[in-house]
Interface confidence: medium
């Protein structure tokens, strides 16, 4: 685990006025073990809309490290390996739940938070706006 | 508040042996308001690796309904609108955190759970295995 200097203003778990607060067991159960997923680890290079992965770290958040996808090109890679600007590489975004320490530095007190992350990229036909 | 028929086996929040349990404020904070995402709701139709969304419901989980992406084709859609089987549509998967009531029906006790969801699909060049 990680040791964090405890904020003296950390809420008391027995405080009945603490806003809609529940006990959450952080021994994460992983439901994915049976599915044995083929990790999509190389898709970011093999895709016609390839992406790079950027590390986003925040020690006040759980999980503290999140990898963000950034599309490499505006267009998509064609059969010749060139970028075709008649198509668009776009990020597939996803909202995820994370836990944020609240107040900061409290080891046992969190708030549920929704953040938006880019998971990968896909190649789409552009929307063409015709000017009258 | 909410009234739930309480499971007599619900853990005691004061129990010091309760496994790595923290207090979590469940009033979800939305970090996305600054970015105001343009929801990529039509990418699933416009992508060269289009996908359908399938409903997965579990009332003991939050979020209770998760729509999973399933790629429509093995191949990818080419410029003529036909499926090109020289390329592959593959799902982009992401592990997300969800909350599960544990034990079931306990209003103040949850477990954090990691599940693998398919967020969308991308078009990749296949890996060709040459037989010696």
């Amino acid at each position: 685990g990680i040791t964090i200097p405890r904020n003296p203003g950390c809420p008391n778990s027995e405080d009945k006025n603490f806003p809609r607060t529940v006990m959450v067991n952080l021994n994460i159960h992983n439901r994915n073990t049976n599915t044995n997923p083929k990790r999509s680890s190389d898709y970011y290079n093999r895709s016609t809309s390839p992406w790079n992965l950027h590390r986003n770290e925040d020690p006040e958040r759980y999980p503290s490290v999140i990898w963000e996808a950034k599309c490499r090109h505006l267009g998509c890679i064609n059969a010749d390996g060139n970028v075709d600007y008649h198509m668009n590489s776009v990020p597939i975004q996803q909202e995820i739940l994370v836990l944020r320490r609240e107040p900061p530095h409290c080891p046992n007190s969190f708030r549920l938070e929704k953040i938006l992350v880019s998971v990968g990229c896909t190649c789409v036909t552009p929307i063409v706006h015709h000017v009258a | 508040g909410i009234t739930i028929p309480r499971n007599p086996g619900c853990p005691n929040s004061e129990d010091k042996n309760f496994p790595r349990t923290v207090m979590v404020n469940l009033n979800i904070h939305n970090r996305n308001t600054n970015t105001n995402p343009k929801r990529s709701s039509d990418y699933y139709n416009r992508s060269t690796s289009p996908w359908n969304l399938h409903r997965n419901e579990d009332p003991e989980r939050y979020p209770s309904v998760i729509w999973e992406a399933k790629c429509r084709h093995l191949g990818c859609i080419n410029a003529d609108g036909n499926v090109d089987y020289h390329m592959n549509s593959v799902p982009i998967q992401q592990e997300i955190l969800v909350l599960r009531r544990e034990p079931p029906h306990c209003p103040n006790s949850f477990r954090l759970e990691k599940i693998l969801v398919s967020v969308g699909c991308t078009c990749v060049t296949p890996i060709v295995h040459h037989v010696a």
Partner: antibody, heavy 126, light 107 residues
């Protein structure tokens, strides 16, 4: 399909409290949230607050904070809206509305009203 | 709070005509805008979610577009049963807010 059936019309005096029920049937009560929206005579729609039963969390519009309490009872699949300190300005039709708890195409689709109760007419008069 | 302003307030339309109702938000709300129809003495009914997503069971003549601050609800080929008041609703930030409504009646 989810059906929301609300309690009957009420006539109240200023200063009294009001408690309206919204009974849900069809679908799992825990798989969605309930919001309350009111409509004064000849006026538009006004959101008062909502609850997410699985999380037990409620959110209220600032205007009603301290005066409104939204609760839910999973055993009877019923949501309640209690409003205290009534004045004639609270004369309105009160609606409960279902809010999905969906994670759709990468987003939490938990913020629109896809099914509505029939409405409860509340008259506040001395 | 986010203010939604609809225009027009009132529209009198001939059947089969195209109806356009606009909704302008006081700040960027992405695509978290929804449209409802309310007929006299009835509860509101969801028509469009997230600016442009259609709802199962809603006739295809109803469509939505826009993002950011400017949104449009279009009824392509108005029918007599479409008379009522139409509301836009934003859910980007609390409190949820609604437009003042646009009343559509049939000539």
């Amino acid at each position: 399909e989810v059906q929301l059936v609300q309690s009957g019309a009420e006539v109240k005096k200023p200063g009294e409290s009001l408690k309206i029920s919204c009974k849900a049937s069809g679908g799992s009560f825990r798989s969605y949230g309930i919001s309350w929206v009111r409509q004064a005579p000849g006026q538009g729609l006004e959101w008062m607050g909502g609850i997410t039963p699985i999380l037990g969390t409620a959110n209220y519009a600032q205007k009603f904070q301290g005066r409104v309490t939204i609760t839910a009872d999973e055993s009877t699949t019923t949501a309640y809206m209690e409003l205290s300190g009534l004045t004639s300005d609270d004369t309105a039709v009160y609606y409960c509305a279902r809010v999905p708890n969906d994670f759709w195409n990468g987003y939490f689709a938990t913020d629109y009203f896809d099914d509505w109760g029939q409405g409860t007419t509340v008259t506040v008069s001395s | 709070e986010i203010v939604l302003t609809q225009s027009p307030d009132f529209q009198s339309v001939t059947p089969k005509e195209k109806v356009t109702i606009t909704c302008r938000a006081s700040q960027d709300i992405g695509s978290a805008l929804h449209w409802y129809q309310q007929k006299p003495d009835q509860s509101p009914k969801l028509l469009i979610k997230y600016a442009s997503q259609s709802i199962s069971g809603v006739p295809s003549r109803f469509s939505g577009s826009g993002s950011g601050t400017d949104f449009t609800l279009t009824i392509n080929g108005l029918e007599a049963e479409d008379a009522g008041t139409y509301y836009c609703h934003q859910s980007t930030s609390l409190p949820h807010t609604f437009g003042q409504g646009t009343k559509v009646d049939i000539k």
